[in-house]
């Protein structure tokens, strides 16, 4: 008998800026939007108003099983993986065009679902488009090589797709991280099952409709929203999945690594937590530094794994910088409605995270740290928190050591370059880092000394799809973006011929 799944109907949504569209609400499996097998749905909330936007289907283990089966068939039974890679590139290019033609809508969906400002959302969508364009270009350019080992032999390598890829993304950059994961996987001939964060599924499902529209074959892209403990666990534990890419907390990342290894020794990419240091040297230009510090920690309401959440300032500039930082935040940085162009910072994405951040602010006060500015929520409705700066902190405080994942930063003083680097490197994390200096030699010397996957000099949280991103130490392993990511989605086969 032919398997039958109930279709999930889209809902019409009018966004706060007046744009209206049809939002898919079903699980996207085998190019169909379907209801979960048990019929369950869950509400998606607008964090700016705390209102329910719509209900979407919540995948069960059985739904994930079916998605894996469909993806498995797409990989093994169709020409997707074996066709001329230029054809995959053409489809990715069409997908980029489609996303670009709808950038206003997709940015608005992102602002509604995530709570980030419309301007920031637009930047995220732009990076997503660029990821797709890069992937389209790289699809037939990432190749093996020939190896000369002397007379009598010919040697070459081929790069082959891995197979079914499980991909789990967080709620802080829903569309951007979807593209970071899906674009290179498809370029290299893999097939994907992506679990968006339960709280931010809207753009993932809308993106799925664009995949179908441009002609990506059934089973190649599957989107399964739902709770991590069922959907995420099903992906990490299933032996048919050969590659798992996870972005999220270090704690969950460790269990993903264990489960992925125990199930079938999956290849894994982990992009995990951070407690990144932002070093400001005496010679830094304060006027240029302030926006970098703000982007470092208050961009996306601090909900960035690479956030510069520990600022270390050289003693000669410390007092001046603190005063300037306070004035800048209190006059230039507005918090509120993501659709209001005047606001730099929107809402925290969900209630749970809002409560976590407010709890950390309370912990900081109890630990004896002083508040330079902020420290309170904004308004009665929605999850808004004023940018918060703690100073007079010591390295043993929880607010200095633990990832808060919100608009909260600590500022401490250092004397020498070596001391600053030592403080920066004292964390078990190693995702991002920042250096503010007018001296190129200082910048490059310190960059070499910092234990981090990314070092930003005179900028921060500044991403480009052509530049790899990832962590060292407990911030994970593997890289996303850049040429490096394409190799993460291939297996190398060596061929040695005796002539």
């Amino acid at each position: 008998t032919k398997l039958h799944f109930d279709t999930a109907e889209p809902v019409k949504i009018t966004l706060p800026n007046g744009l209206t569209y049809e939002q898919p609400t079903g699980l996207f499996i085998n190019n169909k939007f379907m209801k979960a097998q048990d019929g369950k749905t869950y509400p998606v909330e607008d964090p700016s108003t705390e209102n329910t936007v719509c209900e979407v289907s919540s995948a069960t283990t059985e739904d994930v099983e079916y998605a894996i089966e469909c993806a498995d068939r797409a990989f093994h039974d169709t020409e997707w993986a074996t066709q001329d890679p230029r054809e995959r590139g053409r489809l990715l290019s069409k997908l980029a065009d489609e996303l670009e033609s709808q950038i206003d809508l997709v940015s608005s969906i992102e602002a509604l679902d995530n709570g980030k400002t419309l301007a920031l959302a637009r930047g995220d969508v732009t990076i997503a488009i660029n990821c797709l364009r890069d992937a389209a270009a790289y699809a037939d350019k990432v190749n093996g090589r020939t190896i000369n080992t002397g007379d009598g032999y010919m040697n070459f390598t081929t790069l082959e797709p891995i197979g079914v890829c499980g991909q789990i993304i967080p709620w802080n950059f829903p569309i951007m991280m979807l593209a970071w994961k899906i674009a290179p996987a498809l370029a290299m001939g893999n097939v994907c099952i992506l679990k968006p964060a339960a709280v931010t599924p809207l753009n993932a499902l809308y993106f799925a409709s664009l995949c179908k529209k441009v002609g990506i074959p059934a089973g190649v892209v599957n989107i399964v929203p739902g709770p991590g403990r069922t959907v995420g666990a099903a992906l990490t534990n299933d032996p048919r999945i050969r590659k798992l890419a996870f972005t999220g907390s270090t704690e969950v990342g460790k269990s993903v690594a264990v489960d992925s290894s125990e199930s079938n020794l999956k290849k894994i990419t982990l992009e995990l937590g951070g407690k990144s240091a932002h070093l400001v040297f005496d010679d830094a230009n304060i006027k240029k530094t302030l926006p970098n510090l703000v982007n470092g920690i208050f961009k996306n309401a601090g909900q960035i794994c690479s956030s510069g959440s520990r600022i270390y300032v050289q003693e000669g500039i410390y007092d001046e910088l603190l005063a300037a930082f306070k004035a800048y935040l209190e006059t230039e940085i507005k918090v509120g409605n993501p659709f209001d162009k005047a606001n730099f910072q929107g809402a925290i994405t969900n209630r749970q995270q809002f409560d976590t951040i407010m709890n950390y602010i309370d912990i900081g006060k109890k630990e004896g740290a002083k508040i330079l500015t902020g420290g309170e929520k904004v308004g009665d409705k929605g999850y808004f928190i004023r940018p918060t700066v703690f100073y007079d902190v010591n390295e043993d405080m929880r607010i200095v050591k633990e990832e808060i994942f919100g608009p909260v930063v600590t500022v401490a003083k250092f004397k020498t370059l070596e001391e600053g680097v030592e403080m920066a490197n004292s964390s078990e994390f190693g995702l991002g880092s920042g250096i503010e200096t007018e001296s190129l030699s200082t910048g490059l010397k310190v960059a070499k000394m910092l234990k981090a996957g990314t070092v930003w000099i005179n900028t921060y949280n500044d991403f480009d799809s052509r530049v790899p991103f990832g962590g060292v130490k407990q911030s994970g392993y593997g890289r996303e973006m850049g040429e490096e990511v394409y190799h993460a989605y291939t297996e190398v086969k060596a061929v040695r011929i005796k002539l």
Epitope: T1, K2, L3, N30, E69, D72, R73, H76, D77
Partner: nanobody, 111 residues
Framework: QVQLVESGGGLVQPGDSLRLSCAAS????????MTWVRQAPGKGLEWVST???????TYANSVKGRFTISRDNAKNTLYLQMNNLKPEDTAVYYC?????RGQGTQVTVSS
């Protein structure tokens, strides 16, 4: 019209063996990735094993080392050899491919 017909189930004791068959018509087993799934009483559907069109096989960790999936291209039939059966293997077993699934065959393991 596609038809998948499972057979070979039955009541056996723990430690015994069974061989399930899945005869396909209107559908070529060798060019399609084929799976065995099972549903235990009161539980959801659980994947058991896959035989790929390209020839490879994969097994759920719960059955690895005990079950073997195979196919006979000439007979257009998929098989599941189940050894060292355990009470927790009790379920209705279904074979499937390309969005089709058979009616299932009952396997009961009990002493």
């Amino acid at each position: 019209q596609v038809q998948l017909v499972e057979s070979g189930g039955g009541l056996v004791q723990p430690g015994d063996s069974l061989r399930l068959s899945c005869a396909a018509s209107g559908f070529t087993v060798s060019t399609n990735t084929m799976t065995w799934v099972r549903q235990a009483p009161g539980k959801g559907l659980e994947w058991v094993s896959t035989k790929y069109s390209t020839g490879g096989t994969t097994y759920a960790n719960s059955v690895k080392g005990r079950f073997t999936i195979s196919r006979d291209n000439a007979k257009n039939t998929l098989y599941l050899q189940m050894n060292n059966l355990k009470p927790e293997d009790t379920a209705v077993y279904y074979c499937g491919g390309a969005d089709y699934r058979g009616q299932g065959t009952q396997v009961t393991v009990s002493s």
